[in-house]
């Protein structure tokens, strides 16, 4: 509409609906068109009800913004009034019959310029030009830089700052190279950048696992070491392990039909329970084999433990013991059976005695008043324990017994009960199986140690301590600590071992002082079926070596430091070690694997037992050898 | 798992003679103790002696002695209760039932499905 | 021959804990009596559920336990469901013979 015509209209409008009131079609002769009519009117209404009569009504609240009814009336033809734009995103607005339209500002778009124009995201200007970050903002953008870059001129493109050249000490002691967007302070290989002191420092590589087991650091570069308590050595690349190999295999097979009673060290091998009706007395069948000649074989007790019955082996015969209600009794008798050999054992619980058969030949009866163990209401409840005692019952033995014992069971038949119970439990557990073939002697599996406290300090000698040791051996694997003193302070002031020779199938044998050597008794065929024999005598003016074997040793004034050292050890407190070290650093030592194979060691005169030991590992058999792998046409 | 089946409902004339089985899977038959339970009709559980599968002893409730007789095949894991000189009122389901533990007489923990045996004439 | 009593019949509701009793005509039911709780379902089916007083069977729910209250045995359901409606009967061992009770039929609405 041109503006004469639209002042026309507001002169008929104060006319006709403001001096005086208007119907609808008196108000349609003032617009000349329905769709302005039906605009108007019923806002017009609005108006009158909020100012007629002075009335206050709840419409008048959307009138507030008039003063009078002239002002109220005159606004509502103008589209544009109240303003429907967005504020912020308009730039004009155009009033049109019962409509309006509103022009926008560069960045803003929609029917009232609401909607931002994310020029960021425009397809036609990627990026909105910008190099490197867009910022999109309401009604327009603005392109920034990472950190490390700076804004050109045409504030769109981005260029890297040289911090090494803006800042020369940025590295301190390192060397500062730039990068895109930032700069590295490099160190030489080794060493890393500290950002606190701004210099190079040591890397510790062992803590980023670059060695495969063991590793020592040092400024600038690191050390791998294998771990020879686990069979390892360290392969050609310097970092990984490989296995120290085996030079005499053995024949480890065994059978979950054969019971291993030395499965512990200390405690019992097997417990089982039982309840039974009183018909059955206590009865115990096995086949036995051993080449121990002291421990327990089962011990049998009441639920109350006020009646117990021990089968034991003492000086390599039968022994029994037992206490109850009415009597209290020990038997030993029958041939010696600690000979390798099966043989059959029974222990049965007749009405007045306790008969012991060996092969099925009596060879003691025990009289007894009343029953071994008192029913409880018709059944017989009694526990029995294989190979130990169930807690410290030593002061309630007639006769004490080192419980160790080093054998096998098989054939067993408890409580009348066959091998129900025992075999469930032992079919499923390798350690309680029993090798098929053994020797007599002690094997070492190449997996702990046997301790000992020894004295070796002898009041009637004026040399004051002295060592003599006597070694049979028959190793398996070619590297190991036979034997070791270790002091109080983790160092291992002398040590017998073998280690693989560099010539072909053969060992050396190394004595060494701490981590020096200090006698070498190079290649020797020791892992064969025969048993090799080394005899020697140490004190602190010497070390001779008795058996005669070609030798390689350190200078005399060499030998006497390291005795010196030796000596210094002994006059304090040394625990000796059989087959392996205890928890001393890899480094203390030339060799640290556990040696692997049978020994018996005599020191000083004395036969080392190992049911005698302060502490043994469970896998050390104190007794019993492994047979050498015999060689089949098939195998 | 632990299963006893039991063989199948028996009929038989006042005088004779009946054999029920009762075949166990899941464990180690000898290990265990089996009972003997009958039920009859409209009565409570009467129980009538065990069996020990290793050894074959056995031990029957006074009532049953001289008419029951307990056995076992261990190469088929199979337990037998018979029954001689039938009445009528030894109508009942008969059930075996193992001890739940291995040499732990006296601990009923697992049930046959029953036998019924009905003594007719 | 001794003679075992049982509650005839218990009612209990679901969450709720119920105890069945087991006394023996021969004195106070002792552990000597190795106390056994069977469950009876329908179509005759049996499942141990306690022996020797108080050791629950393999695969038994937690909520039943056997006890010794006074001089009686006793089957304790804590917290019983609907599946656990069924009759239960306990045998108690005498000397070289089980006698069992007469069951409690227990109902859990």
């Known amino acids: 509409a041109n503006s004469m015509l639209e002042e026309t209209k507001q002169g008929n409008l104060e006319r006709e609906c403001i001096e005086e009131l208007c119907n609808k079609e008196e108000a349609r002769e003032v617009f000349e068109n329905d769709p302005e009519t039906d605009y108007f009117y019923p806002k017009y209404l609005v108006c009158l009800r909020s100012f007629q009569s002075g009335l206050f009504t709840a419409a008048r609240q959307s009138t507030d913004a008039y003063p009078d009814l002239r002002s109220c009336v005159n606004a509502i033809p103008d589209q544009c009034s109240p303003l429907p734009c967005n504020e912020d995103g308009y730039m004009s607005c155009k009033d049109g019959k019962a409509s309006f339209t509103c022009t926008c500002k560069p960045g803003w778009q929609g029917e009232k310029c609401e909607f931002d124009i994310n020029e960021c995201k425009d397809p036609s200007n990627i990026n909105g030009g910008c190099s490197q970050i867009c910022d999109n903002t309401p009604g327009s953008y603005h392109c920034s830089c990472k950190s490390g870059f700076v804004m050109l001129s045409n504030k769109k493109d981005c260029k890297d700052v040289d911090e090494c050249s803006l800042k020369p000490n940025m590295c301190g002691t390192a060397v500062c190279k730039n990068i895109p967007g930032d700069f590295e302070c490099e160190c030489p290989e080794g060493y890393r950048y500290n950002l606190k002191s701004k210099s190079c420092e040591d890397v510790d590589e062992c803590s980023e696992n670059m060695c495969a087991q063991l590793c020592v650091n040092y400024p600038g570069g690191y050390t791998c070491y294998c771990d020879g308590k686990k069979g390892f050595k360290l392969a050609q690349d310097q970092k990984s392990c490989e296995a120290v190999s085996v030079c005499l295999p053995l024949n480890l097979d065994t059978k979950y039909e054969l019971l291993y009673l030395a499965e512990q060290f200390a405690g019992v091998v097997l417990y089982l329970k039982f309840r039974l009706p009183e018909i059955s007395r206590f009865s115990a069948e096995f086949d036995f084999r051993t080449y121990d000649s002291q421990g327990v074989i089962l011990y049998a007790e009441s639920i109350d433990h006020s009646a117990w019955l021990l089968i034991a082996l003492r000086g390599g015969k039968i022994e029994v013991q037992l206490k109850n209600e009415h009597t209290s009794k020990i038997t030993t008798g029958g041939d010696i059976i600690n000979n390798g050999l099966w043989n059959m054992v029974s222990v049965e619980e007749l009405e007045h005695s306790i008969s012991i058969k060996i092969a099925k030949e009596a060879v003691m009866d025990i009289n007894k008043p009343g029953p071994l163990f008192k029913p409880e209401n018709g059944l017989l409840e009694t526990k029995v324990y294989f190979a130990g005692f169930p807690r410290k019952v030593e002061s309630e033995l007639i006769k004490p017994i080192n419980p160790r014992l080093d054998g096998c069971i098989r054939s067993w038949n408890l409580m009348k009960q066959g091998a129900s119970g025992i075999k469930e439990i032992i079919q499923e557990k390798q350690n309680k199986h029993c090798l098929v073939t053994v020797e007599k002697g002690s094997y070492y599996p190449g997996s702990g140690i046997a301790e000992f406290h020894i004295d070796y300090n002898n009041g009637s000698n004026a040399e004051g301590w002295h060592i003599n040791v006597t070694l049979n051996i028959r190793p398996s694997m070619g590297t190991g600590v036979m034997l070791a003193l270790v002091s109080s302070n983790n160092t291992v002031p002398f040590a017998v071992s073998l280690v693989d020779s560099t010539s072909e199938k053969s060992q050396d044998i190394v004595i060494s002082v701490e981590n020096t050597v200090i006698y070498r008794i190079q290649a020797l065929s020791l892992c064969s079926n025969q048993r090799s024999h080394l005899e020697f005598r140490v004190n602190r003016n010497n070390l001779e070596l008795l058996t005669p074997l070609k030798i390689e040793t350190i200078s005399q004034e060499e030998l006497q430091t390291q005795l010196a050292i030796l000596d210094k050890a002994m006059k304090g407190k040394v625990a000796t070690y059989l087959g392996g070290l205890p928890d001393v650093p890899f480094s203390a030592t030339p060799v640290n694997a556990f040696y692997n194979g049978c020994m018996e060691v005599n020191i000083n005169g004395v036969e080392l037992d190992l049911d005698e030991a302060i502490s043994k590992h469970n896998d050390i058999r104190a007794h019993s050898c492994p047979s050498v792998w015999k060689k089949t046409k098939n195998s | 798992q632990v299963q006893l089946v039991q063989s199948g409902a028996e009929v038989k004339k006042p005088g004779a003679s009946v054999k029920v089985s009762c075949k166990s899977s899941?464990?180690?038959?000898?290990?265990?103790?089996m009972h003997w339970v009958r039920q009859a009709p409209g009565q409570g559980l009467e129980w009538m002696g065990w069996i020990n599968p290793n050894s074959g002893d056995t031990n029957y409730a006074q009532k049953f002695q001289g008419r029951v007789t307990m056995t076992r095949d261990t190469s088929i894991s199979t337990a037998y209760m018979e029954m001689s000189r039938l009445r009528s009122d030894d109508t009942a389901v008969y059930y075996c039932?193992?001890?739940?533990?291995?040499?732990?007489?006296?601990?009923?923990?697992?049930w046959g499905q029953g036998t019924l045996v009905t003594v007719s004439s | 021959q001794a003679v075992v009593t049982q509650e005839s019949a218990l009612t209990t509701s679901p969450g709720e804990t119920v105890t069945l009793t087991c006394r023996s005509s021969t004195g106070a039911v002792t552990a000597s009596n190795y106390a056994n709780w069977v469950q009876e379902k329908p179509d005759h089916l049996f499942t141990g559920l306690i022996g020797s007083t108080n050791n629950r069977a393999p695969g038994v729910p937690a909520r039943f336990s056997g006890s010794l209250i006074g001089d009686k045995a006793a089957l304790t359901i804590t917290g019983a469901q609907t599946e656990d409606e069924a009759i239960y009967f306990c045998?108690?061992?005498?000397?070289?013979?089980?006698?069992f009770g007469g069951g409690t039929k227990l109902t859990v609405l």
């Open positions: 039932a193992r001890d739940s533990q291995i040499l732990w007489f006296g601990e009923l923990g697992y």
């Open positions: 899941g464990h180690t038959f000898t290990g265990y103790y």
């Open positions: 045998a108690l061992w005498y000397s070289d013979h089980f006698v």
